[in-house]
Amino acid sequence: SGTTNTVAAYNLTWKSTNFKTILEWEPKPVNQVYTVQISTKSGDWKSKCFYTTDTECDLTDEIVKDVKQTYLARVFSYPAGNVESTGSAGEPLYENSPEFTPYLETNLGQPTIQSFEQVGTKVNVTVEDERTLVRKNGTFLTLRQVFGKDLIYTLYYWKSSSSGKKTAKTNTNEFLIDVDKGENYCFSVQAVIPSRTVNRKSTDSPVECMGQEKGEFRE
């Protein structure tokens, strides 16, 4: 059912990394436009991306209001140039997205090793605490501030001269590891939320090796 010559959106998909959240859908419009609505389970629907010919809508501003809520979005289809027209049910054609809970589902972005510092046979590796678009009291929160101890980092490290990897874990953004004196090491980190059932791990950070500019060496 629905308005003549309009088709319902389909393949509604959430694309979300570190809470930056975009809804995508198909098809590319032909003689129609779209409006998106988003709501928590309260049913207080908010309209976004009015009468757009895009097939994506940035919903970050809405979901960051409460990342632990579960959201649903719906995409309405209207004939181009006649957006007041409705279908036989007295409503425009629409389709619902899957449910989306940002805290449980947003992808963890690729982390970055901020620095590493060697003091004797110990190396302190620091992971950059990326700022998110989640706000509290007008300030943007970091990933650590949002997830707290739910977020851990895994460090992979190995001697530059060999391929055998070791691992370490932390629920802060810092590692303190033992190394062999006189050896150069390479490092990569991964963000992990162990309690999740989906999207548990980020991709690995770029590899950083001792003897390059991010490091500092002290006897």
Epitope: T40, K41, S42, W45, A89, G90, N96
Partner: antibody, heavy 118, light 107 residues
Framework: EVQLLESGGGLVQPGGSLRLSCAAS????????MSWVRQAPGKGLEWVSS????????YYTDSVKGRFTISRDNSKNTLYLQMNSLRAEDTAVYYC???????????WGQGTLVTVSS | DIQMTQSPPSLSASAGDRVTITCRAS??????LAWYQQKPEKAPKSLIY???SLQSGVPSRFSGSGSGTDFTLTISSLQPEDFATYYC?????????FGQGTKLEIK
């Protein structure tokens, strides 16, 4: 555990009024849309009205528009249905239900019987 | 208004049977359909939403399928506690409407 407890039903004469209440517990009340559904004796289910979590959006079935008013007090975790100009055909068990996104009905109260008769 | 038609109106079956109840909408409702179970003198209970999503706590022998206008509720192996009346409901557009119910009785 989600609990919904209706009250306020009873016997009323045609043209009279009743106010039903539904006390909610076990969940964050303001985070959910809520609905009223009724069931006449020996009959099927009929959706009556829904309200969004904020109370800003309300919806009614045609047969009760202008006579019934749905409302909520989020500070008291309570849903209401004010029923005026009652008719014999409004006789039913009235259920309150939690309604995620204002869509389906995932938790129901035990119901309260409203009888409209002279 | 969207009319919802359930069939059959009543059904006799035995424990262990596989049972299918159908629901047809008078116009397309995508997957915006729910199923409920009601036992005598009790409140309805949610079984399925979004045509095929199982409500939390509902046994996996219940399943739903369909999209557009035709939907089914299937009970893979009837248990004694499943004898009840089943209703479908569309939430595509207001006023939301229910099917007339299917009474599942013991054979």
């Amino acid at each position: 555990e989600v609990q919904l407890l209706e009250s306020g039903g009873g016997l009323v004469q045609p043209g009279g009024s009743l106010r039903l209440s539904c006390a909610a517990s076990g969940f964050t009340f303001s985070n959910y849309a809520m609905s009223w559904v009724r069931q006449a004796p020996g009959k099927g289910l009929e959706w009556v009205s829904s309200i969004s979590g904020s109370g800003d959006y309300t919806y009614y079935t045609d047969s009760v528009k202008g006579r019934f008013t749905i409302s909520r007090d989020n500070s008291k975790n309570t849903l209401y249905l004010q029923m005026n100009s009652l008719r014999a055909e409004d006789t039913a068990v009235y259920y309150c239900a939690r309604s995620p996104w204002g869509y389906y009905l995932d938790s129901w109260g035990q119901g309260t019987l409203v009888t409209v008769s002279s | 208004d969207i009319q919802m038609t359930q069939s059959p109106p009543s059904l006799s079956a035995s424990a262990g049977d596989r049972v299918t109840i159908t629901c047809r909408a008078s116009q397309g409702i995508s997957s915006r359909l729910a199923w409920y179970q009601q036992k005598p003198e009790k409140a309805p209970k949610s079984l399925i939403y979004a045509a095929s999503s199982l409500q939390s706590g509902v046994p996996s022998r219940f399943s739903g399928s369909g999209s557009g206008t035709d939907f089914t509720l299937t009970i893979s192996s009837l248990q004694p506690e499943d004898f009840a009346t089943y209703y479908c409901q569309q939430y595509n557009s207001y006023p939301y409407t229910f099917g007339q119910g299917t009474k599942l009785e013991i054979k």
